[in-house]
Amino acid sequence: APTSSSTKETQEQLDQLLLDLQVLLKGVNDYKNSKLSRMLTFKFYMPKKVTELKHLQCLEEELKPLEEVLNLAQGKNSHGGNTRESISNINVTVLKLKGSETFMCEYDETVTIVEFLNRWITFCQSIISASSS
């Protein structure tokens, strides 16, 4: 059974993941329309369902393409460091949260970068609210 300290740790990690995803989404939405409309041609893969922590495997698998698209959009822009830091944070947090159980992602949908970040933000929020109630 999970201890109160491990539950608290999970909660903190989810809070951190949520924050980093929100930072990335804000960065994307802050781009001038010319950049954003170009970013929206890129595809990101979403699984059939995201309801459990093990499903974070599917987020992990899309982190490299996500970083590449954000780097392309930034070019020589000074926000590059923020993106790298957020992606790195997400990587570390996801590894902690998803556990060691191997999970095979079944992707059934392709979405834009904005939809992708919003879906994972919603996932974090729903897990946080479920675990705190």
């Epitope: 329309n33 409309s37 170009r38 041609t41 890129f42 595809k43 698209v69 392309l72 392709t110």
Partner: antibody, heavy 117, light 109 residues
Framework: EVQLVQSGAEVKKPGESLKISCKGS????????IGWVRQMPGRGLEWMGT????????RYSPSFQGQVTTSADKSISTAYLQWGSLRASDTAMYYC??????????WGQGTMVTVSS | SYELTQPPSVSVSPGQTARITCSGD??????AYWYQQKPGQAPVLVIY???ERPSGIPERFSGSSSGTTVTLTISGVQAEDEADYYC???????????FGGGTQLTVLG
């Protein structure tokens, strides 16, 4: 109604210059890319390049880089495509189209350019 | 430079299903778009983001994607669907747009 209206057909001689236009209406012209597409007689569509009217940021297909110039005057919601020196091989229909997150969703009626001596 | 490959022509009888494919190396990561062009007319968007249909486009038009290939499917083809169809996407950097060579759909009979 959202629309793009292009300038009329042109007949030119080789070596002459030309500037054709594409006027947008019914939407915020500044904040959508305008693409230019060539269609030579009996052939397919070829992407030439795009311009973002708000800041005149441009992208050209490698095939058209240096051959044509795109520009825009956001004060009159108009994009332009121009040639410094036309060739017979520039004879084609030229379309402008609005690029949104859902692709080239609005197209102009096309401008036929004929280059012949 | 980046290319999208389509079959030059597809023929189908009225009421049958027509499938037009488009292949390109960047398609696993770039959305594809489909346009219909009838003689003497400007192209019209029929499918965007691989599978989405703009309002006003009949339900018989649908799109799908698998790996490096996207497919435009027209179910229950009608005579008015006879046209050229072009796929369009971007290169892997999202910088350059490109059109496929086009597919002429002929409705037999």
């Amino acid at each position: 109604e959202v629309q793009l209206v292009q300038s009329g057909a042109e007949v030119k001689k080789p070596g002459e210059s030309l500037k054709i236009s594409c006027k947008g209406s019914g939407y915020n012209f500044d904040t959508y890319w305008i693409g230019w597409v060539r269609q030579m007689p009996g052939r397919g569509l070829e992407w030439m390049g795009t311009i973002y009217p708000a800041d005149s940021d441009t992208r050209y297909s490698p095939s058209f880089q240096g051959q044509v110039t795109t520009s825009a005057d956001k004060s009159i919601s108009t994009a332009y495509l121009q040639w410094g020196s036309l060739r017979a091989s520039d004879t084609a229909m030229y379309y402008c189209a609005r690029f949104s997150s859902s692709a080239y969703d609005i197209w102009g009626q096309g401008t036929m350019v004929t280059v012949s001596s | 430079s980046y290319e999208l490959t389509q079959p030059p022509s597809v023929s189908v009888s009225p009421g049958q299903t027509a499938r037009i494919t488009c292949s390109g190396d960047a398609l696993p990561r770039q959305f594809a778009y489909w346009y219909q062009q009838k003689p003497g007319q400007a192209p019209v968007l029929v499918i965007y983001k691989d599978t989405e249909r703009p309002s006003g486009i009949p339900e018989r038009f649908s799109g799908s994607s698998s790996g490096t290939t996207v497919t435009l499917t027209i179910s229950g083809v009608q005579a008015e669907d006879e046209a050229d169809y072009y796929c369009q996407s971007a290169d892997s950097s999202g910088t350059y747009h490109v059109f496929g060579g086009g597919t002429q759909l002929t409705v037999l009979g």
